[in-house]
């Protein structure tokens, strides 16, 4: 898969492949994988991809199931790239406060907050 | 501030305090703080709170500006708690796939994806 495929298209294709290979993936009934308790997914990307690694090592490879895991590794690469962009640019306090305000605003309206 | 205050109320109050103390906070014109390039805020919580720490160390404390930084540290505590919950529960592959599907679905519809 060329990494030039837009990430949004990659995510869509991966969702489809996940449905296709569901039966094969759940074949191992004894396998247990950490699953986050909440739905703030972005906080848990490390654990999600560790889980994918565990699943891959337990899944018989071949055909399009390989494509599924290849896609997932490209998505991980994209997320790692985004994480790098968290701290690369040093800006003035003014911009930092605008960003902090946006972050808290998003937290206020979109996060799934359990008290 | 009692930690019993619901996190959602804490976030709202913090947003208000941020507006109130803006002028004081931007007083240091030479200070530079990392600001993420993208808006996938949850991926950048570590950098955001490091930035808050830098800002706090450079800000004259006293009055309600202390309450602002106290609130922000409680929000950090909440997020750290959420991060702990990412890997606590070991579940069957079925549940992990449900979570992965939800994660990719959110990525597909809500993430800010630049190719």
């Amino acid at each position: 898969i060329p990494t030039e495929i837009p990430t949004s298209a990659l995510v869509k294709e991966t969702l489809a492949l996940l449905s296709t290979h569901r039966t094969l993936l759940i074949a191992n009934e004894t396998l247990r994988i950490p699953v986050p308790v909440h739905k703030n997914h972005q906080l848990c990307t490390e654990e999600i991809f560790q889980g994918i690694g565990t699943l891959e090592s337990q899944t018989v490879q071949g055909g399009t199931v390989e494509r599924l895991f290849k896609n997932l590794s490209l998505i991980k690469k994209y997320i790692d790239g985004q994480k790098k962009k968290c701290g690369e640019e040093r800006r003035r306090v003014n911009q930092f406060l605008d960003y902090l305000q946006a972050f808290l605003g998003v937290m206020n309206t979109e996060w799934i907050i359990e008290s | 501030i009692p930690t019993e205050i619901p996190t959602s109320a804490l976030v709202k109050e913090t947003l208000a305090l941020l507006s109130t103390h803006r002028t004081l906070l931007i007083a240091n014109e030479t200070l530079r703080i990392p600001v993420p390039v993208h808006k996938n805020h949850q991926l950048c919580t570590e950098e955001i709170f490091q930035g808050i720490g830098t800002l706090e160390s450079q800000t004259v404390q006293g009055g309600t500006v202390e309450r602002l930084f106290k609130n922000l540290s409680l929000i950090k505590k909440y997020i750290d708690g959420q991060k702990k919950k990412c890997g606590e529960e070991r579940r069957r592959v079925n549940q992990f796939l449900d979570y992965l599907q939800a994660f990719l679905g959110v990525m597909n519809t809500e993430w800010i994806i630049e190719s």
């Epitope: 003035r92 605008d98 946006a102 605003g105 | 390039v37 993208h38 800010i112």
Partner: antibody
Framework: QVQLVQSGAEVKKPGASVKVSCKAS????????INWVRQAPGQGLEWIGY????????RYNQKFKGRATLTVDKSTSTAYMELSSLRSEDTAVYYC????????????WGQGTLVTVSS | DIQMTQSPSSLSASVGDRVTITCKAS??????LSWIQQKPGKAPKTLIH???RLIDGVPSRFSGSGSGQDFTLTISSLQPEDFATYYC?????????FGQGTKVEIK
């Protein structure tokens, strides 16, 4: 492709208000700040302010604070710039421009809207 | 506000010439500077950001350099389509401010 399409030219009387629109297409509207810049005839460029469509937060050049109002309509992916108490020196071409990241460079510009203030 | 001083305000050059435009900020703006091209009656177009990063699709004859307070835009070999006005923009702090422009005319 990514595009910002602005509303047509306007002629206004001094003291009136004008509202210029900027319709975004080809990308997710809430992902990028929209900046507004103006250019008086034969003059340079001047930044008015920006709005973050994600949370409606706007920041203004002090020079325009109180007279300029930046808003967005997320349902139509449209940004608006309203300028009140118009005077002849507000005669200019008004541009919207998309911010590539957070407080980053302007990667896409609208075609501009000429606002003429004349009695 | 940060003042951006561009020089020269205009210049005459021939096709194939190497052209250099400078921009000086009144204070340190790190590398948060972009160069913008504007042709008569047209919308501006950003050529370079972060002082020296060429935007996709912009010809490689354009280059930028500098950091802190002093910045330069260079056109290595002027082409007919390059005759325009060029502006620098600092986006380091609010309000963002532009240089007054440099008009590049045909000699």
């Amino acid at each position: 492709q990514v595009q910002l399409v602005q509303s047509g030219a306007e002629v206004k009387k001094p003291g009136a208000s004008v509202k210029v629109s900027c319709k975004a297409s080809g990308y997710t509207f809430t992902n990028h700040h929209i900046n507004w810049v103006r250019q008086a005839p034969g003059q340079g460029l001047e930044w008015i302010g920006y709005i973050n469509p994600y949370n409606d937060y706007s920041r203004y050049n002090q020079k325009f604070k109180g007279r300029a109002t930046l808003t967005v309509d997320k349902s139509t992916s449209t940004a608006y710039m309203e300028l009140s108490s118009l005077r002849s020196e507000d005669t200019a071409v008004y541009y919207c421009a998309r911010d590539y990241g957070n407080f980053w460079y302007f990667d896409v510009w609208g075609q501009g809207t000429l606002v003429t203030v004349s009695s | 506000d940060i003042q951006m001083t561009q020089s020269p305000s205009s210049l005459s050059a021939s096709v194939g010439d190497r052209v250099t435009i400078t921009c000086k900020a009144s204070q340190d703006i790190n590398s948060y500077l972009s160069w913008i091209q504007q042709k008569p009656g047209k919308a501006p177009k950003t050529l370079i950001h972060r002082a020296d990063r060429l935007i996709d699709g912009v010809p490689s004859r354009f280059s930028g350099s500098g950091s802190g307070q002093d910045f330069t835009l260079t056109i290595s070999s002027l082409q007919p389509e390059d005759f325009a006005t060029y502006y620098c923009l600092q986006y380091d702090d609010f309000p963002y401010t532009f240089g007054q422009g440099t008009k590049v005319e045909i000699k």
